[in-house]
Every structure is written in structure tokens, then in C-alpha cells.
């Protein structure tokens, strides 16, 4: 299936040009999306091109400025947040990135009634997290690992926690491992629906081993960065959940929510919190051996001012073939009765589907079914449930939005997006207003992305929010590569692949092949999305064929494929890349003397193992910030898929699956190893150990480090990185510069 045909005709040939590396590094062909900042059923805020904050009313067609760019500029604000009572706006400035999601910032509160900043009892700086209550204009914020509450922006703060300590006790914000591997947020506090209660997590990292690395900066002596970071098998953070009444915070103080007995009996994690009503909350817990998850519904007991979590309201989710959930355990979406809920988990055939749980998980009613997967539940209203799946036309790498009418019997299903812009749009997400009165659809491809606004009752398109016209015009004279998404059937395994082909691709010719791999558990690389990136340039200008393959361990094609890698990472992911390469050679247009593989992070691990597989298939390859041994990576992630590195569990495979164990096998390939020295995620240690093993084996290789750069290798390092990798590949493929 050719998704993006090249627009080359003889008459145009001399005006058309190939992509350049400069195009990619400058972001010349980047696209825009439009996500409304919903403030009601029919209103949203948006930051205009000239930086005014504008309110749009869909029903009246009006739009008006609520905050001028002058006010924004006066404090150098880069972000804002309107209080639910519409009286105040917080303005965020001095953004300072910490880890993937976390950052600190300075916050100013602007009073919209008088057009002035709130003076007196100003917020301290820098703040780690700040948010409005869902009703009114209470503020909760985290400063120096402690939580504070303000009833009104101008009021003095009430301090909720006192034990917060850098790198030791975290209140209302996650520690490193919870941020990256469990919550995927910068916050760990949750307001109840009407702002009566505030729930928060406390993480105790006192006993966690610390990763320490040098940050060189430009001082005489480097700084040492210390992060409590539990590697596989190490001591983990201890988590506790508390809830405080924000109306009378001093009256009873924070009340701890009890952990289910079956969870508390051994090491465990807290995985998410969902408020149901102001007096009912749902907590999800996970055993350290991550195949058992417990969902616990707790109720406020007015008489005791405590939270009660009866055993009858505990729902267990267990996997016998792998780990619980997909990447994370899914979260519940509660219905209007405030006790039953909808949740995605594996059905009896091993496909993730939506289930309706009224009393017990055993009696769950399956809402969706088929040899495809439900991916996200966006919204449940009185009469509709909106979700995304990859059902349409049996392409796992697509995402369409569906509506199930739950108000009628039997429930009827309608695909909202399948036929809207069928060629252009096959990968959607959505953003819903209150009560799903309206929603925005954001289409990511395969054509140029487009964002549209729709009526929540009729699904009618109201207007285009962003169609990337400038990008469309800019691409008119560019020879883009062709892209196709197809599948290989090998030994009862389906391997979906995306192939990116040079603009004048000719099947009778031979082309160098570059495999781009990620391959991590529950990931997906073969997606019907638009991208003009480095590999687009390599196909367009340098005449390479690039392929991405989703092998065993990847997501959204059922548990058989997903859980195939359970307890044995580094085996089947690599095998499936190699199998695909052999199939590509059989297609007849690949020069088998010029095949390379590259990947980043988990992809760097897979590419390293593929190069060291001893097949002789690969001439060269690149590993960027690779994992080299699972003993070096984070406990929460690693143990989910590998179990523990102990003799009586899975130590043997931990040892067998390292890159270092295969050092000898790099002798006959050209290997480029790249890592940032300040990588807080996949520590530089990983590449240091690969390099040491290669040196000890007297194997030649190339390497590049990026001083003081983290896992993302951003800024000027990005330009240097892609330039360096381009030279390496062109040399490997004997392409002239």
C-alpha cells in the first residue's frame, strides 16, 4: 500500500529537489497540531500566534482576548492556566527542565478582574508543581519537596507536609523512577472532583542506591549529579498515599489510605489514583513482580474522618502469560453510578479490550472484541463511550476513534474517523470538552497532519483548527520518499514493516538498506503517521531504503506477540529484525553487501545485539545511548519484563543478554557507539562497559560522547549527532560526499 506517492512528473522534475540534512536539522518541514485548552462544554482557550490568550466560544462563534501578550511578556511567561472560577490566571516562567516530565518554574498570579498581579503572599520560587483546584481558585503547589495549599491566591499558604527533603522524601511529586517508569507525570497529587479533598503520594527514597555522574559545566571542578535510582533488583522507593480535607486542612490533617493486604505482604508499587466522587477514590497497586495488580475503591467515613477500602471493592487483575497490562496497567473510567467502570485488559483470546466491571472482574462484560486492540478510552458520557483502536482494515499501526452507544441496547458502534479523510488520515487522537459536547480530532498522518473541531452529538465537522497549509506549500517542490506499510508472515508470526523508498525507486536496481529499530516491549514503530525526518532525507537524497519492523514484544497485536519476550529480552526482538532483513533481500532490490542497522535507547541495545549476532548480514551499525546490561537499568521497567536478577529467579538470562558478552562478534562489523555523559535514564555506564569489553577483546570500533547531554541529545548536539551518523553511514555504503 503506497501511502505517500511522490509527486514527480517529467515537467516538474527540474523544479523538484531532494531533502537535505539541513532541512531536517532546521525543522523546515515540521508540522503543527491544535489541542484546545477546554474550559467548559463549549469554550476553549488558545494562545494566538502573537501570544495573546484568546477564549473561543464555539456556540456563539465569538472569540476574545482574556490576557494580552503584553502581560505575558511582562513576566516572560511561556505557559498559563486559568482558574476554574475564571478569576485568575497563573503565568509560568523561568522554565527549568529536570527529567522527562519534571521541571521547575516561577509562577505569578494575575487577577483578571482588576488587570493586576496578585501582590502579597507571593509564591516562592522555584516551584516544582502547581495546579488549581477543579472548582474555584484554590492552589496546591510543591516547593522543596513539600506540599502547600492556598484557599485563594492572595492568602497565606497552609503547609500540608513537613518531611520533604531533596533526594530523600518526595511529597506530591514523583522520584526519578516513578516519574519515568510508573506515573509518566511530573506530579503525584490529585484534587477530588469538587476540590474538597487533595490526595498525594509520599515517596521515601532513603534506602535507594544513588547513581552519581559528573556534570562538567565550565567550572574548574565538575559537579556530581546524585539521583536515587533503583536498578534491577535494588531497594525500591517506599510509597504512601495520603488524603487531606482542603476545607479544614488543620482539623484532622492528612489521612493515609490503606494498602490492600495482598499487595502489602511484599514489595509493591502504587500505579495510579482516580477520583470517582468527592468522597470516593480509586487506587491502583502493583506487586513488585508485576503480574498482579489490585484496583481498590475507597470511601470516606465521615464519622472517623478516614478512608475505608473494603475487600469487596478490591478488583484483581493478573497475567499468567506475561506482566499485568501493556506498558502500564490501564486506568479505570468510571460511569455515572460512581461504582461501575470501564477498563482495558486482555480478553480470553489475549487481545486488549474494553470491559465493563459492575461487581467483580470475573463478571466483567466485554464491550469490544476481535483480533485487534482497544487502545484508549477517551470519554464516557451518559449515552456514549469514545475510544480508539486499530481495528479498521486490520492495520495495527492505525488509530481510529469510535463511539459506542451505551445508552441503548444492544450497544451500537460507529467509527467516527474511518472515512473522514481516508487517504490523508489514518492515525488519530482526540480531545473532548466537558460532557463531550464538542471534541477536537488531531490526525497525525500518513498525510500532512490536520486538526479539526467536531460536534459531540452529530460528529459533524465544525471547522478546521490547523491544516498546515504552509507545510503543504513548502513540500510542493520536494521529492519525498515513497512509504509503504506491509506485512511478512514468518513461522506463524506476522511482522509488520514500513519501508521508505527513494523517490525514483526502481525494483530492478539494488539499494543500500538501513534498518531503524526500537523494538522495546509494548512499543510500536510501524505507524501510519507523517514524518519528514533524518531517514526521509537518507531515502530522498542519499538513495537508501529504510525499513522499520515490529517484531515480537511489540504492541497492539495481541498478547502472544507482546508477551513472547517475557523474561528473555534481547532474543526474539533481534531474531525478528534479522528474519525481516533476509526477507527484504529476497525481494531483489537490496544490495546485500550494504546493510546497516541503527537504534536509540532500547533500539541501541537491539542494534548492538543484531550487529553481534554473527549472521554476517550487517556491514555496519550505530547504537545511540544503548542499554548494555539489564542489571544497569531501572527496576520498575526492567523487572516488569525480566523478573529479578537473582539466582532463584532470572539472573542467568540477565547475564546472557548483555552486549558485553558478545564483544568478540563485533570484529567483522563497523560499529559506532554514541552516548551522552549526563544521561540520567540510560546511564553512560552502559556504553562505558561496551567500550571496555570491546577494548579488552581488542575489537576496533568508533565512538562519540556528548558532554553534559542527557538521553535526548538535544540542542546543538542533535545537529552534530545526525551529521556524524550521516558521514558514518555514507562511508559504510561507499556513497560520495
Amino acid at each position: 500500500i503506497v501511502l505517500r506517492p511522490s509527486r514527480v512528473h517529467n515537467s516538474e522534475e527540474n523544479t523538484m529537489r531532494a531533502l537535505t540534512l539541513k532541512d531536517i536539522l532546521n525543522g523546515t518541514f515540521s508540522y503543527k497540531t491544535f489541542f484546545p485548552n477546554w474550559i467548559s462544554g463549549q469554550e476553549y482557550l488558545h494562545q494566538s500566534a502573537d501570544n495573546n490568550i484568546v477564549l473561543y466560544n464555539i456556540e456563539t462563534g465569538q472569540s476574545y482576548t482574556i490576557l494580552s501578550n503584553r502581560t505575558m511578556k511582562s513576566v516572560n511567561a511561556s505557559n498559563y492556566g486559568l482558574s476554574p472560577d475564571r478569576q485568575f490566571v497563573y503565568l509560568e516562567s523561568d522554565y527549568s527542565k529536570l527529567w522527562r516530565y519534571s521541571y521547575t518554574a516561577t509562577y505569578y498570579i494575575y487577577d483578571l478582574s482588576n488587570g493586576e498581579f496578585v501582590r502579597g503572599n507571593e509564591l516562592p520560587r522555584p516551584i516544582q508543581y502547581l495546579c488549581w483546584s477543579p472548582v474555584g481558585s484554590k492552589l496546591a503547589y510543591v516547593y522543596q519537596n513539600n506540599i502547600y495549599l492556598k484557599q485563594r491566591p492572595g492568602d497565606p499558604p497552609f503547609q500540608i507536609t513537613f518531611n520533604g527533603r531533596e533526594n530523600k522524601i518526595f511529597n506530591g511529586i514523583p522520584d526519578w523512577v516513578y516519574e519515568e517508569e510508573m506515573l509518566a507525570t511530573k506530579y503525584a497529587l490529585w484534587w477530588s472532583p469538587n476540590g474538597k479533598f487533595l490526595a498525594y503520594a509520599e515517596f521515601n527514597d532513603t534506602d535507594i542506591p544513588v547513581i552519581a555522574y559528573s556534570y562538567y559545566g565550565d567550572e574548574q571542578y565538575p559537579r556530581t549529579i546524585n539521583i536515587p535510582y533503583p536498578k534491577a533488583g535494588a531497594k525500591n522507593p517506599v510509597v504512601r498515599i495520603f488524603i487531606i480535607d482542603t476545607t479544614y486542612p488543620a482539623y484532622v490533617g492528612p489521612q493515609e489510605v490503606p494498602v490492600p493486604a495482598m499487595i502489602a505482604s511484599s514489595d509493591y508499587y502504587f500505579s495510579w489514583l482516580t477520583w470517582v466522587t468527592d468522597e470516593r477514590v480509586c487506587l491502583q497497586w502493583l506487586k513488585r513482580v508485576q503480574n498482579v495488580s489490585v484496583l481498590s475503591i475507597c470511601d470516606f467515613r465521615e464519622d472517623w474522618q478516614t478512608w475505608d477500602c473494603p475487600k469487596t471493592q478490591e478488583h484483581i487483575e493478573e497475567s499468567r502469560t506475561g506482566w499485568a497490562g501493556g506498558f502500564f496497567v490501564s486506568t479505570p473510567v468510571f460511569s455515572y453510578d460512581a461504582i461501575s467502570y470501564y477498563k482495558i485488559f486482555s480478553d480470553k483470546d489475549g487481545y486488549k479490550h474494553i470491559h465493563y466491571i459492575k461487581d467483580t472482574v470475573e463478571n466483567a462484560i466485554q464491550i469490544t472484541s476481535g483480533k485487534w486492540e482497544a487502545i484508549n478510552i477517551f470519554r464516557v458520557t451518559q449515552d456514549s463511550l469514545f475510544y480508539s483502536s486499530n481495528e479498521f482494515e486490520e492495520y495495527p499501526g492505525r488509530r481510529n476513534i469510535y463511539r459506542i452507544s451505551i445508552g441503548s441496547y444492544p450497544p451500537s458502534k460507529k467509527c467516527v474517523t474511518c472515512h473522514l479523510r481516508k487517504e490523508r488520515c489514518q492515525y488519530y487522537t482526540a480531545s473532548f470538552s466537558d460532557y463531550a459536547k464538542y471534541y477536537a480530532l488531531v490526525c497525525y498522518g500518513p498525510g500532512i497532519p490536520i486538526s479539526t473541531l467536531h460536534d459531540g452529538r452529530t460528529d459533524q465537522e465544525i471547522k478546521i483548527l490547523e491544516e498546515n497549509k504552509e507545510l503543504e506549500n513548502a513540500l510542493k517542490n520536494i521529492q519525498l520518499p515513497k512509504e509503504e506499510i506491509k506485512k511478512l508472515e514468518v513461522d506463524e508470526i506476522t511482522l509488520w514493516y514500513k519501508m521508505i523508498l527513494p523517490p525514483q525507486f526502481d525494483r530492478s536496481k539494488k539499494y543500500p538498506l538501513l534498518i531503524q529499530v526500537y523494538g522495546g516491549p509494548c512499543s510500536q514503530s510501524v505507524r501510519s503517521v507523517f514524518a519528514v525526518n533524518w531517514i526521509s532525507y537518507l531515502a530522498s537524497k542519499e538513495g537508501m531504503v529504510i525499513a522499520l519492523v515490529d517484531g515480537r514484544g511489540t504492541a497492539f497485536q495481541g498478547d502472544k506477540l507482546l508477551y513472547a519476550v517475557y523474561r528473555k529480552l534481547g532474543v526474539y526482538e533481534v531474531e525478528d529484525q534479522i528474519t525481516a532483513v533476509r526477507k527484504f533481500i529476497e525481494m531483489g532490490f537490496i544490495d546485500e553487501k550494504r546493510i546497516a542497522i541503527w537504534g536509540w535507547s532500547y533500539g541501541g541495545y537491539v542494534s548492538s545485539l543484531a550487529l553481534a549476532s554473527g549472521t554476517g548480514l550487517f556491514k555496519c551499525g550505530i547504537a545511540v545511548a544503548p542499554v548494555s546490561s539489564w542489571e544497569y537499568y531501572a527496576s520498575v521497567y526492567t523487572e516488569r519484563f525480566m523478573g529479578l536478577p537473582t539466582k532463584d529467579d532470572n539472573l542467568e538470562h540477565y547475564k546472557n543478554s548483555t552486549v558485553m558478552a558478545r564483544a568478540e562478534y563485533f570484529r567483522n562489523v563497523d560499529y559506532l557507539l554514541i552516548h551522552g555523559t549526563a544521561d540520567d535514564n540510560v546511564h553512560f555506564q552502559n556504553s562505558a562497559q561496551i567500550a571496555k569489553a570491546l577494548v579488552n577483546a581488542q575489537v576496533d570500533f568508533q565512538a562519540m560522547w556528548y558532554s553534559d547531554q542527557n538521553h535526548g541529545l538535544s540542542g546543538l548536539s542533535t545537529n552534530h549527532l545526525y551529521t556524524h551518523m550521516t558521514h558514518f553511514l555514507k562511508q559504510c555504503f561507499s556513497l560520495s560526499d
Partner: nanobody, 115 residues
Framework: QVQLQESGGGLVQAGGSLRLSCAAS????????MGWYRQAPGKRREWVAT???????NYADSVKARFTISRDNAKNTVYLQMNSLKPEDTAVYYC?????????WGQGTQVTVSS
């Protein structure tokens, strides 16, 4: 062009009542969230009350249980019923959208409460 006309102010004794009206024209109607605001002499303008499109109301602590905001969708008018008035309620009262339109305030209506 958005136009909001406040009326109904006046001089009243402490403990008395007044009913303010805000007539909306242009594209403003029941599909907008509306608010009443006030500015006392020598003080900053402050929010008083809000009514949403669905009729949900919200009040400043200082006026709770004394003031009532309402709307008549047919007449495109928003009201503020003020009971048990106090001298500290003396101010110029304005109506606007909520959140208010940036830099767009009418003349307001003066309310004076004598002791």
C-alpha cells in the same frame, strides 16, 4: 461589537436591597458565562459573582447568601439581586463576560450604601 449596559444602582440604606441589571447586545447571549464585578473607592476591582451557561452560580465569600445572580435568556439580561446591603458594598458595579474581556469595561453603575 460587544456591548454591556449596567443599570439599577443608587443610594440605599444599610440593610436595604437593590437589583442591578446588565443588558447585553452584540453577540453576547445565554451561551456566555457572565460575571458581576465591583470597584470600591480607592480599591482594586474585584469579582462578585458568576453565572454559567447552564445556570450554575458562584459567589465571592463577602457576598455569599446576600447576593443572587440570575439571568433572563429571553431578554438577554443578567441580574444581581443585592440584599442586606452593607456600607462596604459601596462601589461601582460592572458586568462583563467571565473571564472578562481584556481591557473592555463599561461605565458601570454606582451603588452607595449609607450607614
Amino acid at each position: 461589537q460587544v456591548q454591556l449596559q449596567e443599570s439599577g444602582g443608587g443610594l440605599v440604606q444599610a440593610g436595604g436591597s437593590l437589583r442591578l441589571s446588565c443588558a447585553a447586545s452584540g453577540s453576547i447571549d445565554s451561551r456566555n458565562t457572565m460575571g458581576w464585578y465591583r470597584q470600591a473607592p480607592g480599591k482594586r476591582r474585584e469579582w462578585v459573582a458568576t453565572i454559567t451557561t447552564g445556570g450554575r452560580t458562584n459567589y465571592a465569600d463577602s457576598v455569599k447568601a446576600r447576593f443572587t445572580i440570575s439571568r433572563d435568556n429571553a431578554k438577554n439580561t443578567v441580574y444581581l439581586q443585592m440584599n442586606s446591603l452593607k456600607p462596604e458594598d459601596t462601589a461601582v458595579y460592572y458586568c462583563n463576560l467571565a473571564p472578562p474581556i481584556f481591557n473592555s469595561w463599561g461605565q458601570g453603575t454606582q451603588v452607595t450604601v449609607s450607614s
